[in-house]
């Protein structure tokens, strides 16, 4: 019987034949930075080269005896469960591990740091096929660190790591607090975040996504075919350095964007039971466990787009949080969100020559968060259009004026403290879909976007009372590029995007008593691109 | 996930230029920062990463560590280059006391400086 | 203490539907994943669906698919199981079941006394 | 899909006796296996969960054992109050879904 965890990211139409390197030219390489490794494991044998690098902290206590066996465990379980021939996920991939780690299983950020850059002065001097570098391991925040693995990841190199066994946001720790890294927590057999003794998965917005990380039988250092069982989110991190290996050795010419969308566009969606996380964080927390791509054919032509959330803004009045998508991503919607209510909404800027999502704060405001909408649109040409507060009761509206521009997008931004309280919302006027709409006092921007038979449309979801929720999806075929409420009155917390789906979210009308406000509409934006589903229907 | 310049809680000590023996002050305006990790028992003091400016070539990260060597005997303190940093980020790891911080804040090309620490296998 | 109580079973025509409410109380209702569970007549358990009532998320078993839909009330602590287009084979005791979190496992440990629902000209 | 079968069906035994019932799992399901106690006219009620754990106000005399695809409840002693039907139910993944056994009766003999 195949363990649950490689029947957990196998989906049911999987073609494993697909998963071979076209040629042998384009052979994936996995570094692993961890404890030494037995290399002669069944297992590993042949598949993982040890290199020379070794940075590592003396072991802690006068009376610590070395054990090649316990040395050994943590990496050669990983390196097993990446690319171990029986239990691997990757069964053919080609490692080197790197020992940054001691027989405690503790190392430093500057070893860290000089593993990581030893792997680029590699890459340097023998360029070859893709590279993914698994760091199963975490530290407190440090700068430093995250700075390494941004000049990495934009070198072409593909990093996965732990998101942290801490059962606390993810963001304190790092490496799984760089935006570049593909950040994994642990689930179970079950789907549920995993318990670690007292603690257990960290969770948070710098998680990527979820991955088999308990109970997950690999190679054991305690003999050549000994096998053992074990849990954290380095189990989980290497889980999706192998689905990441198999899908590039499959598409070899994948950008570290396009795969990290491809992750998160074929996990299971809506799998894991977030009570187990804090409430303040579980909407910020993926609801996505990693799988394989069922086919690698026709993944290309579809539109890719993630959530991505800012850290939060902090309490003071004119506070802002700022979410910012990768370099090879398209920023295509922007969208706040305060649990107290009091927000001055969102809008679209240009800095440093790309768009980011600014979410602003208002007087008496806990805090808010900017969501951004970050998709993968090659040629794309997108600007930002806005319309200044109107000055008549009709409300504020802009539309896309340029020929061939989509609206992908709306935001909306005020000045007043509470706005829409005692106002009636605005209605878009019937047959003008193409437009954003907003209240009269607030400015409205909206993302117009023009590539290559891009086409968009609107669909809204409205509820004639409050409700905690309401949401609008986008159908089969379609992706959510926007995701926004019509417009904001003051129960309003915000609006954000969940997979395809747009979530609108008020205040709890059980404990406001207020049911006097009006209608709560959620705004979807959905897309697709007409050339890319041709090409699409061809290939089938 | 998290932005590049950090909001979250490490410690950053922003210490200003002030005249001193060999030190060029840092360009005008700008002022290097320290870092530390939240985690006090994960803290490793002694060891230091000095992250010198994005375009900083391997010859002035190699000088500027002689130079921190070179002030801090004068001051009669030991230090210790362990590893010069290129290929990903300039800088260099330096033993050291935490006394001379603020001297080495102020070498030029500094960005900043983070005090290493512990981590661990998950 | 932790009590869940169903109601709304009762007599239906075939080709009908009907609604089964689940009222909770002695727990944070929003906290808990909530279950709906069948058992016909000498038969065994079959599970249904569920609802997690803190986001509306729902699952439901494929042979259910278009035929039930759990819904919540989080203001009454309520559960609900709509069941359309109802046949004589969905005579049955109808169960809800709280989903309780028990050192990194999970499972149904509390369930109402059931509802019975006779579908029948 | 996950097909749980359990076995016996149904048995007969007496006060004092050691009753072992079976679980299999069609697929691996690690140790996420529950057993449910259900009388005749009343709801199921929980027994063990994760393939071992007692539920608390459960009589020891219940164990669980297992994992991956082959479990098993023991009742060490039968008690007169344990006349019932034992069902073992797991976690499908594959339709987000939750899989019951076929049940196992325990009448007296």
């Known amino acids: 019987s195949i363990p649950w965890n490689l029947e957990r990211i196998t989906p049911p139409r999987y073609r494993a034949d697909e998963y071979q390197p076209p040629d042998g030219s384009s052979q994936v390489e996995v570094y692993l930075l961890d404890t030494s490794i037995q290399s002669d494991h069944r297992e590993i044998e042949g598949r993982v080269m040890v290199t020379d690098f070794e940075n590592v902290p003396e072991e802690d206590g006068t009376r610590f005896h070395r054990q090649a066996s316990k040395c050994d465990s943590h990496g050669t379980h990983l390196a097993g469960v990446v690319s171990g021939r029986d239990a691997g996920v990757a069964k053919g991939a080609s490692m080197r591990s790197l020992r940054v780690l001691n027989c405690q299983g503790k190392g430093t950020v500057s070893g860290t740091l000089i593993g990581l850059e030893f792997i680029r002065k590699s890459q340097l001097i023998q360029p070859s096929g893709p590279l993914v570098v698994l760091l199963p391991l975490a530290g407190g925040y440090s700068r430093v660190l995250n700075a390494a693995c941004q000049r990495l990841a934009r070198a072409g190199v593909v990093l996965v790591t732990a998101a942290g066994n801490f059962r606390d946001d993810a963001c304190l720790y790092s490496p799984a607090s760089a935006p570049e890294v593909i950040t994994v927590g642990a689930t179970n057999a079950q789907d549920q975040p995993v318990t670690l003794g007292t603690l257990g998965t960290n969770f948070g917005r710098c998680v990527d996504l979820f991955a088999p990380g308990e109970d997950i039988i690999g190679a054991s250092s305690d003999c050549s075919t000994c096998f053992v069982s074990q849990s954290g989110t380095s189990q989980a991190a290497a889980h999706v350095a192998g689905i990441a290996a198999m899908m590039l050795s499959a598409e070899p010419e994948l950008t570290l964007a396009e795969l990290r969308q491809r992750l998160i566009h074929f996990s299971a969606k809506d799998v894991i039971n977030e009570a187990w996380f804090p409430e303040d964080q579980r909407v910020l927390t993926p609801n996505l466990v990693a799988a394989l791509p069922p086919s690698t054919h026709g993944a290309g032509w579809q539109l890719f787009c993630r959530t991505v959330w800012s850290a939060h803004s902090g309490p003071t009045r004119m506070a802002t949080a700022v979410a910012r998508c990768a370099p090879d991503e398209e920023l295509l919607s922007c969208s706040s969100f305060s649990r107290s209510g009091k927000r001055r909404g969102e809008r679209m800027e240009a800095q440093g020559g790309k768009l980011v999502c600014r979410a602003h704060n208002a007087f008496g405001g806990e805090g808010v968060y900017a969501i951004a909408r970050c998709c993968l649109l090659p040629q794309a040409n997108c600007s930002v259009h806005t319309a200044p507060p109107a000055e008549a009761s009709m409300g504020t509206r802009v539309h896309c004026h340029q020929q061939g521009h989509v609206l992908t997008g709306c935001s909306s931004h005020w000045e007043v403290e509470d706005l829409g309280t005692h106002k009636p919302p605005v209605l878009r006027p019937r047959g003008q879909p193409n437009q954003c709409v907003g209240h009269r006092e607030a400015s409205i921007h909206a993302s117009c976007c023009h590539a290559p038979g891009l086409e968009c449309k609107v669909k809204e979801h409205g509820i004639p009372a409050p409700q905690e929720q309401v949401t609008v999806a986008c159908e089969e075929g379609w992706t959510l590029t926007g995701c926004s409420a019509l417009p904001g009155t003051s129960h309003v917390l915000g609006a954000y995007a969940v997979d395809n789906t747009c979530v609108v979210r008020s205040r709890d009308v059980s404990t406001t008593g207020s049911t006097s406000e009006g209608a709560v509409t959620a705004v979807a934006i959905c897309c697709r691109s007409r050339h890319l589903a041709q090409a699409s229907q061809e290939l089938q | 996930q998290e932005d590049e310049d950090g909001d979250y809680e490490e410690l950053v000590l922003a210490l200003r230029s002030e005249e001193d023996g060999l030190a060029e002050a840092p360009e005008h305006g700008t002022t290097a920062t320290f870092h530390r990790c939240a985690k006090d028992p994960w803290r490793l003091p002694g060891t230091y990463v000095v992250v010198l400016k994005e375009e900083t070539h391997l010859s002035q990260s190699e000088r500027t560590a002689r130079r921190l060597q070179a002030q801090a005997a004068r001051r009669g303190y030991l230090t210790k280059i362990l590893h010069v940093f290129h290929g990903l980020l300039p800088g260099f790891l330096v033993k050291m006391s935490g006394d001379l911080l603020e001297l080495a804040l102020k070498l030029p090309h500094v960005d900043y400086i983070e005090e290493d620490s512990s981590v661990f296998a998950q | 203490e932790v009590q869940l109580l169903e109601s709304g079973g009762g007599l239906v025509q075939p080709g009908g539907s009907l609604r089964l409410s689940c009222k909770a109380s002695?727990?944070?209702?929003?906290?808990?994943?909530m279950h709906w569970v069948r058992q016909a007549p000498g038969k065994g358990l079959e599970w249904i669906g569920r609802?997690?009532?803190?986001?509306?998320?729902?699952k439901y078993n494929e042979k259910f698919k278009g035929k039930a839909t759990i819904s919540r009330d989080n203001s009454k602590n309520t559960l609900y199981l709509q069941m359309n287009s109802l046949r004589a084979e969905d005579t049955a005791v109808y169960y809800c079941a709280r989903y309780g979190y028990y050192l990194g496992s999970y499972a149904m440990d509390y369930w109402g006394q059931g509802t019975l629902v006779t579908v029948s000209s | 899909d996950i097909q749980m079968t359990q076995s016996p069906s149904s048995l007969s035994a007496s006060v004092g006796d050691r009753v072992t019932i079976t679980c299999r799992a069609s697929q691996d399901v690690s140790r996420y296996l529950t057993w449910y106690q259900q009388k005749p006219g009343k709801a199921p009620k929980l027994l063990i969960y994760?393939?071992?754990s007692l539920q608390s106000g459960v009589p020891s005399r219940f164990s669980g054992s297992g994992s991956g695809t082959d479990f098993t409840l023991t009742i060490s002693s039968l008690q007169p109050e344990d006349f019932a039907t034992y069902y073992c139910?797991?976690?499908?993944?594959?339709?987000?879904?939750?899989?019951f056994g076929g049940g196992t009766k325990v009448e007296i003999k």
């Open positions: 139910q797991a976690y499908d993944y594959s339709l987000s879904g939750y899989v």
């Open positions: 609802i997690d009532p803190y986001n509306g998320g729902t």
């Open positions: 994760a393939a071992s």
């Open positions: 002695g727990y944070t209702f929003s906290s808990y994943w």
